[in-house]
Interface confidence: low
Amino acid sequence: WELTILHTNDVHSRLEQTSEDSSKCVNASRCMGGVARLFTKVQQIRRAEPNVLLLDAGDQYQGTIWFTVYKGAEVAHFMNALRYDAMALGNHEFDNGVEGLIEPLLKEAKFPILSANIKAKGPLASQISGLYLPYKVLPVGDEVVGIVGYTSKETPFLSNPGTNLVFEDEITALQPEVDKLKTLNVNKIIALGHSGFEMDKLIAQKVRGVDVVVGGHSNTFLYTGNPPSKEVPAGKYPFIVTSDDGRKVPVVQAYAFGKYLGYLKIEFDERGNVISSHGNPILLNSSIPEDPSIKADINKWRIKLDNYSTQELGKTIVYLDGSSQSCRFRECNMGNLICDAMINNNLRHTDEMFWNHVSMCILNGGGIRSPIDERNNGTITWENLAAVLPFGGTFDLVQLKGSTLKKAFEHSVHRYGQSTGEFLQVGGIHVVYDLSRKPGDRVVKLDVLCTKCRVPSYDPLKMDEVYKVILPNFLANGGDGFQMIKDELLRHDSGDQDINVVSTYISKMKVIYPAVEGRIKFS
């Protein structure tokens, strides 16, 4: 018995087609993705093949003006229109709190939304009960397939799930649910979830009874053969993991931003064992037409967005590199721009001894969600910035000891190389890392811009000195694992809205050209 699994993950509000780098579409003839194009391909495959499941592995929420304005209603509406069969909760589904998940998505979705390792407690337990499920048994042709969901247990560090949701270890939570499906004689089980490729592989290895893992969160691109676009494969598609009980378990992900539609064909024997698996992500390029009815619906919903944020704020004459491939690995000029804007927004020359009360900025690279292409006449709009900074946070002022900052920079690279969001972009700081050293001892040089000086210059960080730092409220609250900031900050003053800070700076500067200039180095 053959099953076709179509899958998306980390779509991040890319309802409309995008440029090749998943930023705003500039030249429509070269644009990709979007739900109208996705629908065309899905329908094509549904017409051609008998047993098709369309699955999403989480993080539909957050990323463009669509989410800024519609707050998840757009996700429910268009996923319903595409007739998704199931979705796993991603960490970003909690960005507007639990209510921002329940009302627009959980209550409106016409498909099951899954996570086995999220447990509600307190008053939320009854409110949310049944609105998401640990698993769902789906009829597919003459067979049934069990889909069991999972979500990154780091979600409380990455989003806003509140205090009444407990995120359990994925493997520990998944096993009993898979066992339950087995007792119901469901012998074909897909783990659909959002914890990253490393966890996906662990689930394939450790959870007995899981036949296929469909993942997300790490934006992993897998491909067999010659890749069709810029993404470099992290491995073959599907990636085969040998489970502890000797089975070959296919693991898949489909990059991100709706650029690809994952396509996996699985052959099962009569006992539900995987006999074979093959496929590849399908690049949703402009050769695939956008479905007219979905496109018309997009255009109808688009009207509200057009009134929101299309005015030009200023211009860039350089590419603003906000890609995760850059900002989560090295200094990126988008990070520099944002940090410069954050410092500029906090210029308070109140004392002759100090050129300013604060000189330093840190910014988690994972908070930078999109690049901006300069080839659109250099125009920067609020809409562009909303894709870069979609979280609606604030840039806050804190006071920290030097020792806390040192811990923060060690945390920045404690698991370097996994495309995790805690890698810090900086302003008013020069840092040098040695990645050959063990985690926790990788910062070999940390110089900070003086404030009590007439000519600003960089001096070594002093462990016992108290420094003022501008940072996102997300970091001040211990997000991305920066618990030391939350625990050790001496003062915290809430600041201005993030997009507003950057837009004000761009409007003030009129033309910007941020460079990569050696703020972050590796020895």
Epitope: K107, E108, K110, Q127, G130, P134, V144
Partner: antibody
Framework: QVQLVQSGAEVKKPGASVKVSCKAS????????LSWVRQATGQGLEWMGE????????YYNEKFKGRVTMTANTSISTAYMELSSLRSEDTAVYYC??????????????WGAGTTVTVSS | DIQMTQSPSSLSASVGDRVTITCKAS??????VAWYQQKPGKAPKLLLY???YRYSGVPSRFSGSGSGTDYTLTISSLQPEDFATYYC?????????FGGGTKLEIK
């Protein structure tokens, strides 16, 4: 305690429509499914369809498709079943029944007392 | 649709008897079977779900078993209040279907 309180008996003429209500209390209305099951006098049980008030999802028995509409008003925790083009063979007791679809509890755990619908000219 | 064939359609037994009612599905329903008890003029009451799990408050004399297409309800020692009609139901696939019922009468 969980209660499903149904509307009163109805007498309808052939060709007419009937709308039966089912008011839920004692639990979170949007957290469970509600099925509608009917039983003609001296006969067995027949599943008509179900609604998940949390999402508005409806699934109908093909036999009733086109004639049955199931809706829910979450603000008053009430589900409705409307059956149109009534004929004499629709004379039955109509039950709403709660379905706990979270986990493996495959069954209707609470039932309304039933609404008798008589179709007669 | 999945047919649920219940047998017997009626059964006479005495208090203290052990009674078995069977239900055969027209296809594998993966233990997604519930059993209900109904008394005249009343709504059905859930006894067992997922073939063998007793619903809360249901006496231990009621038990269920089965897998695939064949399912059984057993009452180990009939009590006076057990005389009623019993229905099986598959909750595996829509439309959910019921057996024709077994009327359990006093001998």
């Amino acid at each position: 305690q969980v209660q499903l309180v149904q509307s009163g008996a109805e007498v309808k003429k052939p060709g007419a429509s009937v709308k039966v209500s089912c008011k839920a209390s004692g639990y979170t209305f949007t957290s469970y499914g509600l099925s509608w099951v009917r039983q003609a006098t001296g006969q067995g049980l027949e599943w008509m369809g179900e609604i998940y008030p949390g999402s508005g999802n409806t699934y109908y028995n093909e036999k009733f498709k086109g004639r049955v509409t199931m809706t829910a008003n979450t603000s008053i925790s009430t589900a409705y079943m409307e059956l149109s083009s009534l004929r004499s063979e629709d004379t039955a007791v109509y039950y709403c029944a709660r379905y706990d679809y979270l986990g493996s509890s495959y069954g209707f755990d609470y039932w309304g007392a039933g609404t008798t619908v008589t179709v007669s000219s | 649709d999945i047919q649920m064939t219940q047998s017997p359609s009626s059964l006479s037994a005495s208090v203290g008897d052990r009674v078995t009612i069977t239900c055969k599905a027209s296809q594998d329903v993966s233990t997604a079977v519930a059993w209900y008890q109904q008394k005249p003029g009343k709504a059905p009451k859930l006894l067992l779900y997922s073939a063998s799990y007793r619903y809360s408050g249901v006496p231990s004399r009621f038990s269920g078993s089965g897998s695939g297409t064949d399912y059984t309800l057993t009452i180990s020692s009939l009590q006076p209040e057990d005389f009623a009609t019993y229905y099986c139901q598959q909750h595996y696939n829509t439309p959910y279907t019921f057996g024709g019922g077994t009327k359990l009468e006093i001998k």
